[in-house]
């Protein structure tokens, strides 16, 4: 902490300007009024202060606002934001999307830092839900943001916000997250026609149940293997060879390339070899002709 010393004569800052970069740390502490700094925060960003000088400026703001900075100051923090700790940020009440954008801009191009994560958490909690504009902003800065949320947090996303989600935003989502997002997407896109609906819902299908996949198979959607491979295994298993053929359309040939990978492998094991042979792909591993299939899970449930 900087020791309290009197400001030398003639050095009292009348405004925040470039002359301050020549001030020693103790001079900044003694000669810059915290209230003046707070009202002229927007100028700080344009001045090439050293990290040590920024520490002093932060210290002055901390003294002025021990309960947390007001939004008028937060919005203009600029690079001073990088000096904030998650503990500092937890004291803030950020409600303006413009403030959020301004601070995310400072961290742009970098991984999500603990400070940014805390800021986003405070902002979203303050709003009560992840609305479309917020989601738009967050995924623009961090495409993986949505998949960093827990299923519980995702449950607060309203279906209307799903329109802001791009396919790449879901790349790292796991099945548990897609289980939450899929019903919301289904609701959001329910009024679209067949082909348009499929284009929009495609990225979310990792959360789709069997009955929805069966319904899609009746709509000539031609699902590609990249999408098929991301489906829930338990949703794929009950599909018949005919349903998978309809679901994939011309892409059905791709099953051969994935015959050892889930969910294709597990699905093949459930099909009659005769039925697989009708595809003409050379798929192996189906149930031989004449074998009886027992559903042991049902038997266990009964016993």
């Amino acid at each position: 902490e900087v020791e309290k010393t009197a400001c030398p004569s003639g050095k009292k800052a009348r405004e925040i300007d470039e002359s301050l970069i020549f001030y020693k740390k103790w001079e900044l502490e003694a000669c810059v009024d915290a209230a003046l700094l707070a009202t002229q925060m927007d100028r700080v960003n344009a001045i090439p202060f050293t990290y040590e000088q920024l520490d002093v400026l932060k210290h002055k703001l901390d003294e002025l606002y021990p309960q947390g900075y007001p939004e008028s100051v937060i919005q203009h923090l600029g690079y001073l934001f990088l000096k904030m700790s998650p503990e500092d940020i937890r004291k803030w009440n950020v409600t303006s999307l413009e403030t959020l954008k301004a601070l995310l801009e400072v961290n742009k191009g970098h991984e999500m830092s603990p400070q940014v994560a805390t800021l986003i958490d405070r902002f979203v909690k303050g709003r009560g839900q992840l609305d479309k504009d917020t989601l738009d902003t967050l995924t623009a800065f961090y495409p993986g943001y949505l998949c960093s949320l827990s299923p519980e947090e995702l449950s607060s996303v309203p279906p209307s916000s799903i329109w802001a989600v791009r396919p790449q935003d879901l790349d790292t989502c796991d099945p548990r997250q897609l289980d939450v997002l899929y019903p919301k997407a289904r609701l959001a896109f329910q009024n679209m026609n067949g082909s348009e609906y499929f284009v929009k819902i495609q990225s979310f299908l990792g959360g789709a149940p069997t009955e929805d996949l069966k319904a899609l198979s009746q709509q000539n959607v031609s699902m590609d293997l990249a999408t098929f491979m991301k489906l829930r295994t338990d949703a794929v298993l009950p599909l018949t060879v005919a349903e998978v053929q309809k679901l994939l359309g011309p892409h059905v040939e791709g099953l051969k390339a994935e015959e050892r990978h889930r969910p294709v492998r597990d699905w093949i094991l459930r099909q009659r070899q005769d039925d697989l042979d009708t595809l003409g792909l050379g798929l192996q591993g189906g149930i031989p002709n004449g074998y009886l299939v027992l559903d042991l899970s049902m038997q266990e449930a009964l016993s």
Epitope: M229, G254, L255, A257, E258, G282
Partner: antibody
Amino acid sequence: DVQLQQSGPELVEPGASVRIPCKAAGHTFTDYNVDWVKQSHGQSLEWIGDVNPNTDGAIYNQKFEGKATLTVDTSSSTAYMELRSLTSEDTAVYFCARRRLGQGGFDSWGQGTTLTVSS
Amino acid sequence: QVVLTQSPAIMSASPGEKVTLTCGASSSLISKYLYWYQQKPGSSPKLWIYSTSNLASGVPARFSGSGSGTSYSLTISSMEAEDAASYFCHQWSSYPYTFGGGTKVEIK
């Protein structure tokens, strides 16, 4: 521009292990399997196995079971191959290659990592 | 496993000459699962022909592929200097995927 970037040459002692990374850029990582291929002294190619980035499930050529372990880290779009209990027989160039889900053939290859096992 | 045997192992051809490389499989393949790769010294292999007869993007039209069952071939209708390379056939009809031993094509 699709790229698979592999690490530089490795010189390791017999009995040791090595982990070779393959970082992907320019495509949606989860839309492609990553396959690994061995080429000994400029001769033929041997398929080691492949890994699916969605399930992290790997399939191996039986010859390389217990020798190679294939994994992926989707957050960094990187596939890895670990080779263990190395002997001089493992001296080779190792390539990673991408294969679009549902398609055969490798449409893009890494530059190869030369592994030399020697004491 | 399916063994792929390529012949000849090495060959040289004059510019303008027709070149045919063969690839025999130890058991019958579905032809769409037979591919060819080109590799030049110090470089990675490149996908050259897929599904027996389809040229990969950027491959000159003087190349062609054909075959079925256990017998496949790659043909260069008129050899050029840039075609000097090794060519490997590859099958993914059954596990494990396998490659042929390669044919090295040199220019005279």
